[in-house]
């Protein structure tokens, strides 16, 4: 039975040219995290494997930095970075937990963080 929940940074906005941290946190489970995948729509951005560390997509290696923790830092943001991001936690024995973050990249300087929310 999957008892865990994923808390994410929720709906967030950031300025074009700036950077943003995408964060998810898995709680309420003792399951072991074997791998975390970060995806943007259908594209894999990065993997953090429990044994073998971080791996970044070659398409994003100049703009994506691992961490902090199991999070992901996006740099040199463009308007095209607007969209949904998913953190996919592979765990044993629970299975897979998925968190969703919506990022809006704004032209102006009115960007601010949205509220945190939970996905059961």
């Amino acid at each position: 039975m999957m008892t865990g929940t994923i808390e994410t940074t929720g709906n967030i906005s950031a300025e074009k040219g700036g950077s943003i941290i995408l964060q998810c946190h898995l709680s309420s489970t003792t399951a072991q995290v074997t791998q975390v995948n970060w995806e943007q729509q259908d594209q894999l951005l990065a993997i953090c494997n429990a044994d073998l560390g971080w791996h970044i997509s070659p398409s994003f290696k100049d703009r994506v930095a691992p961490g902090p923790g199991l999070g992901l830092t996006l740099q040199s943001l463009t308007v095209n970075d607007t969209g949904e991001y998913f953190c996919i936690y592979h765990t044993y024995p629970d299975g897979t937990y998925t968190g969703r973050i919506f990022l809006e990249v704004l032209e102006s300087s009115v960007a601010e963080h949205g509220a945190r929310f939970q996905i059961p």
Partner: antibody, heavy 117, light 106 residues
Framework: EVQLVQSGAEVKKPGASVKVSCKAS????????IYWVRQAPGQRLEIIGR????????YYVDKFKNRATITADTSASTAYMELSSLRSEDTAVYFC??????????WGQGTLVTVSS | DIQLTQSPSFLSASVGDRVTITCKGS??????LVWYQQKPGKAPKLLIY???NLQSGIPSRFSGSGSGTEYTLTISSLQPEDFATYFC????????FGQGTKVEIK
């Protein structure tokens, strides 16, 4: 042309150590991680570990954490894998391979390590 | 980690045959599947990445497809140089390999 050239076959006694080399050419050695993978007779490939030549950071799967040591000499564009306390079940072909993002794009030709008394 | 099972383990075929090899995951592989070819005493060669993307320099007779837990490698018309062992690899959860499929001359 990317090439990974490994050292020759080795025969070792149980309890001994073996060190296999992998010389890279055709690309910037520090830009890609090198993995070591092995294939025992009749078995599937299994990962031993990884090194990032840029910073020397190493990662090992649990099974090999206490026996494998992966190093790199950036001046020689060469990675090494040393396996200690050899036993008969370590008889295998050992490969180095470059990881491109999430998958392995170029491989060495393999080094047969035979452990026999 | 995901376990990959290939079928068949051995396959006898003739030049010109259409050959299909299957790779099944113990969990969803999410299309993060790669195919390699290996000949005795040689380095494995990358054929297809991300389920259906042909690696540069690989002949178009090789193709890949699949989703979820089941993936296939197809050789549309087997050539003499295609007799080899083929194996799959996934990175959706852990980095694991299939046991290989040996394609032999009938």
């Amino acid at each position: 042309e990317v090439q990974l050239v490994q050292s020759g076959a080795e025969v070792k006694k149980p309890g001994a150590s073996v060190k296999v080399s992998c010389k890279a050419s055709g690309y910037t050695f520090t830009e890609y991680s090198i993995y070591w993978v092995r294939q025992a007779p009749g078995q599937r490939l299994e990962i031993i570990g990884r090194i990032d030549p840029k910073n020397g950071r190493t990662y090992y799967v649990d099974k090999f954490k206490n026996r494998a040591t992966i190093t790199a000499d950036t001046s020689a564009s060469t990675a090494y894998m040393e396996l200690s306390s050899l036993r008969s079940e370590d008889t295998a072909v050992y490969f180095c391979t470059r990881i491109y993002g999430f998958y392995f794009d170029f491989w060495g030709q393999g080094t047969l390590v035979t452990v026999s008394s | 980690d995901i376990q990959l099972t290939q079928s068949p383990s051995f396959l006898s075929a003739s030049v010109g045959d259409r050959v299909t090899i299957t790779c099944k995951g113990s969990q969803n592989v999410n299309k993060y599947l790669v195919w390699y070819q290996q000949k005795p005493g040689k380095a494995p060669k990358l054929l297809i990445y991300n389920t259906d993307n042909l690696q540069s320099g690989i002949p178009s007779r090789f193709s890949g497809s699949g989703s979820g837990t089941e993936y296939t490698l197809t050789i549309s018309s087997l050539q003499p140089e295609d007799f080899a062992t083929y194996f799959c690899y996934q990175y959706n959860n852990g980095f694991t390999f299939g046991q290989g499929t040996k394609v032999e001359i009938k």
